[in-house]
């Protein structure tokens, strides 16, 4: 029977800069029941605080709700593991909420084949930003990426869409059924998961772009 091994805070993520969650990996348990607590202070503050919510993020997590989330301060946090034989502490982790944003995927992806009379046909897609993100505040710039592939193909073709929420693709294989997905990331932060796939059948008479 031993004191617990050193835990590690391995990830912190925010969906929208308004709340965030951090997760830790326990070290070895030393063969005894082990209690974990996360403590933190904010830069410029010597008062220590304890995790306000150990439940919402699941096991080995700490969730910071709106009233505990500040964009303008770096958080300094650590996890303490304690059993009957002693304690161990994780390394301190410095967290700036601005840099840990991972949005939800974009919503309402729609894809259409457009066949104008006077121009080459193209695939047109549009989507909406995730609902948790309020772009009106100006705190966010969201960037988008699209990927598509024929249903039976192994490789995805990826296109960067910048800040626009619609996109055109000209070169497609006629008669194929395509899967299309979109994802987003803030200017500082992480890519979202890909949106659920939208399927589109390309007509057999679709004229390939030269």
């Amino acid at each position: 029977q031993l004191p617990p091994g050193k835990p590690e805070i391995f990830k912190c993520r925010s969906p929208n800069k308004e709340t965030f969650t951090c997760w830790w990996r326990p070290g070895t348990d030393g063969g005894l029941p082990t209690n974990y607590s996360l403590t933190y202070h904010r830069e410029g503050e010597t008062l220590m605080h304890e995790c306000p919510d150990y439940i919402t993020g699941g096991p080995n997590s700490c969730h910071f709700g709106k009233q505990y989330t500040s964009m303008w301060r770096t958080y300094v946090m650590m996890v303490n593991a304690t059993n009957q034989m002693g304690s161990s502490f994780s390394d301190e982790l410095y967290v700036d909420v601005t840099y840990i944003v991972q949005p939800d995927p974009p919503l309402e992806l729609t894809v259409e084949v457009k066949q104008p009379e006077d121009r080459k046909p193209y695939l047109w897609m549009k989507w909406s930003p995730p609902t948790l993100i309020d772009l009106k505040t100006g705190w966010f710039t969201l960037l988008y990426e699209i990927r598509l592939k024929p249903e039976k193909a192994a490789e995805w073709e990826t296109h960067f869409a910048g800040q626009q929420t619609e996109f055109k693709i000209l070169s497609l294989h006629p008669g194929q059924k395509y899967l299309v997905q979109v994802r987003c990331k803030p200017d500082h932060g992480y890519w979202s998961a890909w949106s659920p796939a939208t399927f589109i059948q390309i007509p057999s008479d679709f004229i390939m772009n030269d």
Partner: antibody, heavy 118, light 107 residues
Framework: EVHLVESGGGLVQPGGSLRLSCAAS????????MNWVRQTPGKGLEWISH????????YYADSVKGRFTISRDNAKNSLFLQMNSLRAEDTAVYFC???????????WGQGTLVTVSS | EIVLTQSPATLSLSPGERATLSCRAS??????FAWYQQKPGQAPRLLIY???SRATGIPTRFSGSGSGTDFTLTISSLEPEDFAVYYC?????????FGQGTRLEIK
């Protein structure tokens, strides 16, 4: 609606003990830091103790360290202050305070009066 | 411990006027700073936290500014219910401390 209701105050002789309680309702008590603050006519507001959600972090003012003990029972939504070796200068209205934004209480009880006198 | 000095001790103004209350800290508290209002027989009420953020339900006529050692609470146009005692508070370091209070009274 949030309610914090203190009880346990009263008249006690110097050197005596009292246990204050604070019953909380209307919020998820177990998630929040809680505090005891007292107010005397002479000294104004004085923050005397702080306890984190699972009692991992506890602070005391120097004026009460070694004499007062803060504790909580999350299962019963209750906060406590055990006061021993009471002195005349501990005479005050004692407020329980919680629902914090980074340690700042947004909600307070109405207070309970503690008088230490022979 | 960090000492907070409020000025003036008493401020006499009329409804509709602008009130400016000051608080100076003996050392920097960054922006870990709050303002409370207290009326006779009542508990303090949080007005401003983090130096300039209004607490839930606080009218927009209340605003806070400052960082480091000098802080100001401004009430843009006094309402009759604003006459009370105002306390500043720091929580940059333990012990958390309060100023001695400014009494805002009707002229």
């Amino acid at each position: 609606e949030v309610h914090l209701v203190e009880s346990g105050g009263g008249l006690v002789q110097p050197g005596g003990s009292l246990r204050l309680s604070c019953a909380a309702s209307g919020f998820t008590f177990s998630s929040y830091e809680m505090n005891w603050v007292r107010q005397t006519p002479g000294k104004g507001l004085e923050w005397i103790s702080h306890i984190s959600s699972r009692s991992v972090i506890i602070y005391y003012a120097d004026s009460v360290k070694g004499r007062f003990t803060i504790s909580r029972d999350n299962a019963k939504n209750s906060l406590f202050l055990q006061m021993n070796s009471l002195r005349a200068e501990d005479t005050a209205v004692y407020f329980c305070a919680g629902i914090t934004i980074f340690g700042i209480p947004e909600y307070w009880g109405q207070g309970t009066l503690v008088t230490v006198s022979s | 411990e960090i000492v907070l000095t409020q000025s003036p001790a008493t401020l006499s103004l009329s409804p509709g006027e602008r009130a400016t209350l000051s608080c100076r800290a003996s050392q920097s508290v960054s922006s870990y700073f709050a303002w409370y209002q207290q009326k006779p027989g009542q508990a303090p009420r949080l007005l401003i936290y983090d130096a300039s953020s209004r607490a839930t339900g606080i009218p927009t006529r209340f605003s806070g500014s400052g960082s480091g050692t000098d802080f100001t609470l401004t009430i843009s146009s006094l309402e009759p219910e604003d006459f009370a005692v105002y306390y500043c508070q720091q929580r940059s370091s333990w012990p958390i401390t309060f100023g001695q209070g400014t009494r805002l009274e009707i002229k």
